[in-house]
Interface confidence: medium
């Protein structure tokens, strides 16, 4: 196998087509991104097309909490999702092709840890197998990045500014601009996972408004300009 010592191969039973599971030792990804947790297996039940269940759990094998589960009916390629923790887990592989690879969306630092894949044949060939070593998911922190900055019409012919940034840990946002004191307090908006939004509710003067996002890994800045057309004197 070309993936060398990154791979854990677990097997038991007789030679020929035995139960075995292949998972990489470690997968690295950045917070906010998606990660693929690969898992493939072989089994002794030739051409099995009965009902099956694919399971992923976290923490420890056999007993850790399930984060994903799907079931496929006899003769069906469709593995219907029965559990996807926070809706962020989905099967990337095809269990009928001995592939249980899982995709994890919108990673957070708290997702770091070990994950274990398991397959259960629940038909005549009643059998199951689970990865003992699992795959270690390492989620690394992400420096701030401003994903959107804009000026929008506000109440009473005024304007307001919005700044959305992402990072892990979630960055703190601050606005600065041409108002007296050259700085304005931002109303911290709703944070969605690793994204945060701050609003500057009233832009009182023309000029440059700068949004700064900062966390323990760094800072990012973006600016927007407001120029209103004033009628001739």
């Amino acid at each position: 196998d070309a993936s060398g010592d990154l791979l854990n191969t677990e097997a038991h039973s007789a030679p020929a087509q035995r139960w075995s599971m292949q998972v990489p030792a470690e997968v690295n990804a950045e917070a906010g991104d998606a990660a693929v947790l690969p898992c493939t297996f072989t089994h002794p039940h030739r051409h099995y097309d009965g009902p099956l269940t694919a399971i992923w759990r976290s923490g420890e094998p056999y007993a850790g909490p399930q984060v994903f589960r799907c079931t496929a009916a006899p003769g069906s390629e469709l593995c219907q999702t029965a559990l996807s923790l926070h809706g962020r887990f989905r099967l990337l592989g095809n269990p009928r092709r001995n592939d249980l690879s899982l995709r994890v969306e919108r990673l957070a630092l708290a997702d770091s840890g070990r994950y274990f894949c398991r397959v259960e044949f629940t038909g005549d060939a009643h059998d199951r197998y689970e990865s003992r070593h699992g795959v270690r998911l390492r989620v690394t922190a992400a420096a701030p990045r401003i994903v959107n900055i804009s000026v929008l019409p506000g109440p009473a012919h005024a304007f307001r500014a919005l700044c959305t940034a992402e990072g892990e840990p979630p960055p703190a946002l601050a606005w600065s601009g041409p108002a007296p004191g050259n700085s304005s307090a931002a109303l911290q908006g709703q944070g969605h996972g690793y994204q945060v939004t701050a609003e500057l509710p009233a832009l009182t003067r023309d000029g440059r408004y700068t949004c700064t996002a900062a966390n323990s890994l760094g800072r990012a800045e973006a600016s927007v300009y407001l120029f209103r057309f004033h009628g001739a004197p």
């Epitope: 196998d1 070309a2 993936s3 990154l6 791979l7 191969t9 075995s20 292949q22 990489p24 997968v27 693929v36 690969p38 493939t40 297996f41 072989t42 051409h47 097309d49 009916a73 003769g75 069906s76 390629e77 469709l78 099967l91 990337l92 592989g93 095809n94 009928r96 092709r97 001995n98 592939d99 690879s101 995709r103």
Partner: antibody, heavy 117, light 108 residues
Amino acid sequence: QVQLVESGGGLVQPGGSLRLSCAASGFTFTNYAMNWVRQAPGKGLEWVSYISYSSSNTYYADSVKGRFTISRDNSKNTLYLQMNSLRAEDTAVYYCARGAGLGYDVWGQGTLVTVSS
Amino acid sequence: DIELTQPPSVSVAPGQTARISCSGDNLRSKYVYWYQQKPGQAPVLVIYDTNDRPSGIPERFSGSNSGNTATLTISGTQAEDEADYYCQTYDMTSQDVFGGGTKLTVLG
């Protein structure tokens, strides 16, 4: 950016051999199953072969079984297709494609294989 | 082995809805994928898992599956949608299967 680049195509006589390569970049190659798909001139797509991320599972279309061998070198981020006992009907553009259960989401630009005497 | 059957060609006026069918035994119990291929280019995945759209694919592309027939629907068809479209699924024998392809012509 995510990219697949095939190479190794060319003109070969019936009964001859050829090895195609597919260099992957811009993504973690070791995490993904890979496939070869071919398209004869003016015809539709035909799946040729599949290999799991760890090389533990390989599958072939009936039309190439016993003649073609799929493999991968994860240390080189490269997918291969060894084609032996080539026939005129193997003439096609050969694409490598990333993917398994969510479809083939990344394709190479293809390499032309012509089998003719 | 499963066989997927598509109409060889479908024509549609700009702005109208195009529907491309793909039929096969027991297709309702399988995931279906759709690919768009323009002349001289590699195919592009436009629908996966029967009705999901990859990022970057316009919302006018959608998929459905009823009985033994899967359908790719393009609403508000544009000239740039003119291409060949292929459906694909997996077979129990671990074979991947493509339909024969449908040439979509946008009139005008």
